[in-house]
C-alpha cells in the first residue's frame, strides 16, 4: 500500500562505531520526505529526523540509553509538501530495519596508542581509553567503562629490523612486554571482543615506533 507517488525506503542499514549510530537507507528522495521511528522490542515508538530529505538519521541519543537493548527502526515515506497524506490503507508507507543490539554489534573504533615507556628490558604500552557517547550520571563513559573485561586489546610488536610480529594481550589498557636491549621496536594495537561472533575486532591503530615522539626511554 501507500500513495502512488511515494516509494518505500529500502536497504535499511545500521552504521555504528563505538556506539555512534546512524541508520542509512535508500533511495535518494524524489518528491518525498522521510521520518524515522525507533523503539526497543517492548517499548513505544519514538519519532526522529522528521520529514527529512536525508537518507540517514543519527539515532545515537536513543540507543545510548541502554546499549544492551535490541532496537528496531522504521522509515516512513511521505509525499513532499503533503505529509498528512496516507496510503490506501490509511497509513504512510514504511519499511522496517533489521534488529540492532549496540553492545553486540557496534563496530570497535580504531584504537590509539597513547604512550610507551621503556625501562631497561621492559616496555609499558598504554592504549588511549576512548570516550563514547554513552552516559552514566551525566558523564560520558569510556569504551572500557562500557565493555569492562569483555574488551581486550591485542598488541603487535616487532623489532624495527624484523618483520615477524609478536603478540601480547590485556584486559586493561596497558601492556608490559619484554624487549631486547638496544633494539628499537614498533607497536600496533587492535581492540577485540572475543565473546562476539561478528564485528569482533577493530582496525589496527596507527603504528608507533621507539625513537619517535610518543615514547620515553629510561636506562636503569
Amino acid at each position: 500500500s501507500g500513495t502512488t507517488n511515494t516509494v518505500a525506503a529500502y536497504n535499511l542499514t545500521w552504521k555504528s562505531t563505538n556506539f555512534k549510530t546512524i541508520l542509512e537507507w535508500e533511495p535518494k528522495p524524489v518528491n518525498q520526505v522521510y521520518t524515522v521511528q525507533i523503539s526497543t522490542k517492548s517499548g513505544d515508538w519514538k519519532s526522529k529526523c522528521f520529514y527529512t530529505t536525508d537518507t540517514e538519521c543519527d539515532l545515537t541519543d536513543e540507543i545510548v540509553k541502554d546499549v544492551k537493548q535490541t532496537y528496531l527502526a522504521r522509515v516512513f515515506s511521505y509525499p513532499a509538501g503533503n505529509v498528512e497524506s496516507t496510503g490506501s490503507a490509511g497509513e504512510p508507507l514504511y519499511e522496517n530495519s533489521p534488529e540492532f543490539t549496540p553492545y553486540l554489534e557496534t563496530n570497535l573504533g580504531q584504537p590509539t596508542i597513547q604512550s610507551f615507556e621503556q625501562v631497561g628490558t621492559k616496555v609499558n604500552v598504554t592504549v588511549e581509553d576512548e570516550r563514547t557517547l554513552v552516559r552514566r550520571n551525566n558523564t560520558f563513559l569510556s569504551l572500557r567503562d562500557v565493555f569492562g573485561k569483555d574488551l581486550i586489546y591485542t598488541l603487535y610488536y616487532w623489532k624495527s629490523s624484523s618483520s615477524g610480529k609478536k603478540t601480547a594481550k590485556t584486559n586493561t589498557n596497558e601492556f608490559l612486554i619484554d624487549v631486547d636491549k638496544g633494539e628499537n621496536y614498533c607497536f600496533s594495537v587492535q581492540a577485540v571482543i572475543p565473546s562476539r561472533t561478528v564485528n569482533r575486532k577493530s582496525t589496527d591503530s596507527p603504528v608507533e615506533c621507539m625513537g619517535q615522539e610518543k615514547g620515553e626511554f629510561r636506562e636503569i
Epitope: I152, Q190, D204
Partner: antibody, heavy 120, light 107 residues
Framework: EVQLVESGGGLVQPGGSLRLSCAAS????????IHWVRQAPGKGLEWVGY????????YYADSVKGRFTISADTSKNTAYLQMNSLRAEDTAVYYC?????????????WGQGTLVTVSS | DIQMTQSPSSLSASVGDRVTITCRAS??????VAWYQQKPGKAPKLLIY???FLYSGVPSRFSGSRSGTDFTLTISSLQPEDFATYYC?????????FGQGTKVEIK
Amino acid sequence: EVQLVESGGGLVQPGGSLRLSCAASGFTISDYIIHWVRQAPGKGLEWVGYIDPSNGYTYYADSVKGRFTISADTSKNTAYLQMNSLRAEDTAVYYCARDPQSLTSPFDYWGQGTLVTVSS
Amino acid sequence: DIQMTQSPSSLSASVGDRVTITCRASQDVNTAVAWYQQKPGKAPKLLIYSASFLYSGVPSRFSGSRSGTDFTLTISSLQPEDFATYYCQQHYTTPPTFGQGTKVEIK
C-alpha cells in the same frame, strides 16, 4: 558449524615446495587468528606460525623462518602455508587451528590435518 | 622462548584410576595454559583453558589447576575413551609452545 579443512599435502622431494590450504567455514577468518601446527610421525606438537588475516601480520617458528610463508585470502575464507626448501625433518601432519584471540586464547578448533612427506 | 616441561612422558593406568599430569613453565605464563587430548590419527581437542576452565562439552572428570608456574591436568576417574596423548600449551607469549606430551596407556 565451525570447520577447518586442510588440503595440499603429499610427497615432495627435498628442496621442493608445497602449498597447503586451510579452508574455513562457519566463521570469518579475518575475525580470528589462524595458526599452523605440525606433528612429525610419532612426535609431539610443534607450532609453525600464525597469521592475522585482518592485517596480514605473521610470526614464524625459528625452524621454518625464511622458508615458510603464511598468507590468507579473506574473500575465499582460506589461509595458506607455502613451504619452500623442504627438508626431511619437515615431514609431518600439518594442522591449522583457530585462535579466538581472547586472554585465555587457546586453539579452540583444529582441522583434521594433511600429511606432508619429504623424501627422495 | 618459554619451555613447557611435561611429565611423565607416558603412564599406565586402569579404568577408574585417578591420573595426574604436570607441566612446568620455564617462566611466568600467568594462567595462559591449555590442555589438549589427542587420539591416534586425529587432531588435538581442547579440554582445559586458562589453566582451570573446562571447555564446553568436556566431561567434568577432567580438571586443571595452577600453582605458580606448575600446571596440573587431573582425570578423576579414568574412562576407556580417555586413553590418549595429552599436551599442555602456553599461549602467554609468542611463540606459543607445547609440552612434549603424555601418553596414557591401559595397564
